[in-house]
């Protein structure tokens, strides 16, 4: 049914989902402060621009009484209700903030039709891709798979002067949200990971990752997982590794890398870490104070979520447009914005843009340190540390199968 | 050593406004969220109100329209001011910090008693 | 609105026994629930929060379990000083609430 969208005569709302089964088991008080932090910002970032205008939150909870899981397997209706609680309240805002499950996204945008913007903190999966009114303020599993790609075919750094074409991936069904979507993309044949290597094979057992470690018939020396480093521990423990096995672990939230005193255990120094480089400012903010390393992206993609609709409300205004009008809608893409945290870019499909890091353990120091970082936006590398410390033999990254020689 | 300490309880008459003041010492208001919490005589604890360390504030569905919840980091105080009381707000007002995480009040203090009556 | 119902209301116990307490919430808030104690004429004091992980200072003889909406605190070895009343508190959401709190319950050792 067609419902008003709360909209105009100077009055602006956003409408919030929020889902009890969500991406990361973040407490809704957390989203809730950055959702209302955001609206602080927007309020003075448009009375300044001599706006005067009303711009509020309407948090739309679910009632909890179906979709019990407390994660995202059972948010596929879970999205749908909390819709038709909207359209039966005839109160839609002039954006949807939420949800951030790839399986409620995806049915949302497909059940309904989409005349405002839908900002999401997170729906990695790559079903949602290339939705167009679709936004995503974490890094989608695209992002991800592109860097891969580009890293696995680098051969022209000091440290890395073979190209790879194979990988092991690890993927026990037991990953979070956001690494479920991640491996599942790698592991999908049609993905363009699949389409650009020669060889990959998913472990899906404990046990078959652990043999891969030390088999001299093993087809790839690469294994990708996707956690932190105490997930990793309880998969490898101290057993020993072969010298030519690099393990990429794919942990995009998580700035504890980056935090001081944090030593490298032991059992990482096989390991390269890629991770997203944390906001200049983020660790030590009072937004963040409260929140765990994991969390902080996520509540902060809530935040930014707000502050994206502020800018484009801004825009709109000025030049005298519509706010409901699929033009609006369909905005959400193709940009630079004020984050809460320095300017924040969205490519051409709405996703955002972001500078990845991958981190080696130096075997000096013992510490985390960059290897190179990754700018999703025009897909390209830049070393960052030329010698690095590494474990592998002349401080190269080794060939991805064994006994081969330079490609 | 870290404290916190209720005061501006005492007798009211019904449709007084109450104004309480919650002191600190030993913590920086800027880094952990402040509650009110109060318990009616020989009943249960019930939620009041929240600032966080962001000043922003949010109100049990019952308290909305007649609470208000600030800070001042400069004196270390947290204020709660509540309009229309009736018999009925007779209660032991506390002032609760939660953990720097969120995950529990940590840090409570004595109480005030407060009472509405003609 | 996340509701929490704590049963039961009151509970005996002997000295050396042990004693259950439920605290039902009306939907899914994960872990994020805390228990506290208090003794008449004084202020809650923290035991458990994140559901199961014991407060600073509080004996192992208290222990919470539970996750999503069904959640318990017991206490075994039961002492005398035990004797108090015992809240449960949802930490998830500030946003939703008409309290936060259960209703208490009154353990009393005998």
């Known amino acids: 049914s067609q419902v008003s969208q709360n909209c105009h005569n100077g009055s602006y709302e956003i409408s919030v989902l929020m889902m009890g089964n969500s991406a990361f088991a973040e407490p809704l008080k957390n989203l809730e402060d950055a959702v209302n932090e955001g609206l602080e910002i927007v309020r003075g970032r448009l009375q300044n621009a001599g706006l005067n205008v009303t711009v509020n939150a309407t948090f739309m909870y679910s009632d909890g009484l179906i979709h019990n899981s407390g994660d995202c397997r059972s948010s596929t209706c879970e999205g749908l209700d909390l819709l038709r609680k909207i359209s039966n309240a005839q109160r839609m805002g002039c954006v949807l903030i939420g949800p951030s499950c790839t399986y409620s996204t995806f049915q949302m945008y497909l059940d309904t039709e989409l005349s405002y913007p839908m900002i999401s903190a997170g729906s990695f999966g790559l079903s949602c891709d290339y939705k167009e009114t679709l936004t995503r303020l974490m890094s989608p599993a695209r992002k991800l798979m592109y860097f891969l790609v580009n890293f696995w075919k680098t051969n022209d750094l000091p440290f890395k002067t073979y190209s790879w074409s194979t990988s092991y991936v690890y993927k026990n069904g037991t990953e979070t949200e956001d690494c479920f979507w991640y491996l599942n993309a790698l592991e999908a044949s049609v993905s363009y990971f699949s389409h650009e290597l020669g060889f990959k094979v998913v472990l899906r057992q404990d046990k078959e990752f652990q043999d891969i470690l030390m088999d001299h018939n093993r087809k790839s020396n690469v294994i990708i997982m996707c956690g932190g480093p105490e997930f990793l521990y309880k998969l490898k423990g101290d057993r020993a590794v072969a010298e030519d096995i690099v393990i990429i672990l794919v942990d995009l939230f998580n700035d504890q890398y980056f935090e001081d005193n944090v030593t490298a255990p032991d059992y990482m120094k096989n390991v390269l870490v890629l991770t997203l480089s944390p906001g200049n400012s983020l660790l030590n903010s009072s937004f963040s104070r409260n929140l765990s390393p994991t969390k902080r992206d996520f509540a902060l993609a809530y935040l930014n979520g707000i502050l994206l609709f502020g800018h484009m409300l801004k825009i709109f205004l000025e030049n005298g447009e519509n706010i409901t009008t699929p033009k609006f809608a369909h905005a959400f893409r193709n940009l630079t914005f004020e984050g809460y945290d320095g300017p924040v870019t969205l490519d051409d499909w709405g996703d955002v843009d972001s500078t990845m890091v991958l981190l080696y353990t130096s075997v000096d120091t013992k510490k985390y340190k960059v290897l190179l970082t990754y700018d999703t936006h025009v897909n390209k590398t830049y070393p960052v540390d030329m010698s690095p410390t590494f474990t592998w033999k002349n401080s190269k990254l080794p060939n991805d199968i064994t006994g081969r020689g330079p490609q | 050593c870290q404290s916190v300490k209720e005061s501006g309880g005492g007798l009211f008459k019904p449709t007084d406004t109450l104004t309480l003041t919650c002191t600190v010492s030993?913590?920086?208001?800027?880094?952990?969220?402040m509650n009110w919490v109060r318990q009616t005589p020989g009943k249960g604890l019930e939620w009041i109100a929240i600032?966080?360390?962001?000043?922003?504030?949010y109100y049990a569905s019952w308290a909305k329209s007649r609470s208000t919840i600030t800070r001042n980091t400069s004196e270390n105080t947290v204020t709660l001011k509540m309009t229309s009381l009736t018999a009925a707000d007779t209660a032991t007002y506390f002032c609760?910090?939660?953990?720097?995480?969120?995950?529990?009040?940590?840090?409570w203090g004595p109480g005030t008693l407060v009472t509405i009556s003609s | 609105a996340y509701d929490m119902t704590q049963t039961p209301a009151s509970v005996e116990v002997a000295v050396g026994g042990t004693v259950t307490i439920k605290c039902q919430a009306s939907q899914s808030i994960s872990n994020w629930l805390a228990w506290y104690q208090q003794k008449p004429g004084q202020s809650p004091k923290p035991l458990i929060y994140?559901?199961?992980t014991l407060a600073s200072g509080v004996s192992s003889r208290f222990r919470g379990s539970g996750s999503g909406t069904q959640f318990t605190l017991t206490i075994s070895g039961v002492e005398c000083a035990d004797a108090a009343t015992y809240y449960c508190q949802q930490t998830y959401t500030n946003n939703h609430l008409d309290n936060g709190f259960g209703g208490g319950t009154e353990v009393v050792v005998k």
């Open positions: 609760a910090r939660e953990d720097s995480m969120g995950y529990y009040f940590d840090l």
């Open positions: 994140r559901a199961s």
């Open positions: 030993g913590f920086s208001l800027s880094s952990h969220r």
């Open positions: 600032i966080t360390h962001n000043s922003i504030t």
